[in-house]
């Protein structure tokens, strides 16, 4: 069951999934000046059996000007570097080391893909939030959102993260809030 809406937005924060539930779709979007190859699938789909999940289909982009020339799917080192993401929190780091059953990992980049990935999430998906660079967590309660089905409708739980650019935290004496990674995510993930 696909989630009806996007995950909630948090001001000055981005979200990321560690792993994607089976049934998740990722649009094959290309950057300006490129388009999906004619025979190419419009999306990748996370599918699997009891032991292994993987992305079906491959996204491929070709120059809008070129005819009958398919660009290779393997990304260049610079592109791989550009898309490298930071770990968000300890629970994400842990999940990142373990292969979650019924989940796909982040798909590798394809050449000339669009800068923003558009996912179609399914019920049960969790996404994690982090304040972007230059902002700090004024309050960090559960910084995640889960797509749930209630009364036949899907809804995302509300993350309890407040990010602020204001300085001078007035914390309790001798107490420090655990810091998120100083780097924000390079880009926000989006669902439609």
């Amino acid at each position: 069951e696909l989630c009806d809406d996007d995950p909630p937005k948090i001001t000055h924060a981005t979200f990321k999934a560690v792993a994607y539930k089976e049934g998740t779709m990722l649009n094959c979007e290309c950057k300006r000046g490129f388009r999906r190859i004619k025979s190419g699938s419009p999306y990748m789909l996370c599918t699997g059996n009891s032991s292994h999940s993987s992305w079906d289909n491959q996204c491929q982009c070709t120059s809008s000007a070129a005819r009958n020339t398919t660009k290779q799917v393997t990304p260049q080192p610079e592109e791989q570097k550009e898309r490298k993401t930071t770990e968000m929190q300890s629970q994400m780091q842990l999940a990142d080391q373990v292969s979650l059953p019924g989940h796909c990992r982040e798909p590798p980049p394809w050449e000339n893909e669009a800068t923003e990935r558009i996912y179609h999430f399914v019920v049960g998906q969790t996404v994690y939030y982090q304040c972007v660079q230059g902002y700090r967590a004024l309050h960090r309660g559960p910084a995640e959102s889960v797509c749930k089905m209630t009364h036949g409708k899907t809804r995302w739980t509300q993350p309890q993260l407040i990010c602020t650019g204001e300085t001078e935290p007035s914390q309790f004496p001798g107490e420090e809030e655990p810091q998120a990674s100083p780097d924000g995510l390079p880009e926000s993930e989006t669902s439609r």
Epitope: T11, G141, P169, E175
Partner: antibody, heavy 115, light 107 residues
Framework: QVQLVQSGAEVKKPGASLKISCKGS????????MHWVRQAPGQGLEWIGV????????IYAQKFQGRATMTVDKSTSTAYLELSSLRSEDTAVYYC????????WGQGTTVTVSS | DIQMTQSPSSLSASVGDRVTITCRAS??????LEWYQQKPGKAPKLLVY???TLAEGVPSRFSGSGSGTDFTLTISSLQPEDFGTYYC?????????FGQGTKLEIK
């Protein structure tokens, strides 16, 4: 069930200080920030500020900066609002409200400032 | 600070009517908007959050829509218990501000 229970009504003289409390129960207190909002008689709602129940870090509306102090006591799951140099315009009902979307509110504390 | 302007400031409607209250933000607030209902002598109650998500336990006759600067709260079929004052509020960034309120009376 989630409950925010506030302290009782207060009558104060101009220039005095006031401290009201808001005790949370039925949920993990430090998961949700706490906001303070007030409502003068017959008027609308006015946001005072927000405090992290986890770190004690707070942000105030400019109007209340320096005169309002929000604190929390995690051991008793209680948030406090202190307002100093009271004036008659501070006569209002003061509410605490939970989380990013103000999903639960206290019942309100009526504060009267009068000489 | 972001200003929130509601209209109308008051309205009177009959049971069964479709009622619409609007809220305009002085700048783009995406969907960072809540709607509350307040009855005399009581604390406000969350109806809608993130512009269109119905809070738990809120009847489905209530709905929210809009994004950016213009938002709407709709009651599809007014019930006697829906009287009270309705407020919009943004949580885009501090300071969070409220609309001035819309008083709804039942004819």
């Amino acid at each position: 069930q989630v409950q925010l229970v506030q302290s009782g009504a207060e009558v104060k003289k101009p220039g005095a200080s006031l401290k009201i409390s808001c005790k949370g129960s039925g949920y993990t207190f430090t998961d949700y920030a706490m906001h303070w909002v007030r409502q003068a008689p017959g008027q609308g709602l006015e946001w005072i500020g927000v405090i992290s129940t986890y770190s004690g870090d707070a942000i105030y509306a400019q109007k209340f900066q320096g005169r309002a102090t929000m604190t929390v006591d995690k051991s008793t799951s209680t948030a406090y609002l202190e307002l100093s140099s009271l004036r008659s315009e501070d006569t209002a009902v003061y509410y605490c409200a939970r989380g990013v979307t103000f999903d639960y509110w206290g019942q309100g504390t009526t504060v009267t400032v009068s000489s | 600070d972001i200003q929130m302007t509601q209209s109308p400031s008051s309205l009177s409607a009959s049971v069964g009517d479709r009622v619409t209250i609007t809220c305009r933000a002085s700048q783009d607030i995406s969907n960072y908007l809540e709607w509350y209902q307040q009855k005399p002598g009581k604390a406000p109650k969350l109806l809608v959050y993130n512009a269109k998500t119905l809070a738990e336990g809120v009847p489905s006759r209530f709905s929210g829509s809009g994004s950016g600067t213009d938002f709407t709260l709709t009651i599809s079929s007014l019930q006697p218990e829906d009287f009270g004052t309705y407020y919009c509020q943004h949580h885009y960034d501090t300071p969070y501000t409220f609309g001035q309120g819309t008083k709804l009376e039942i004819k």
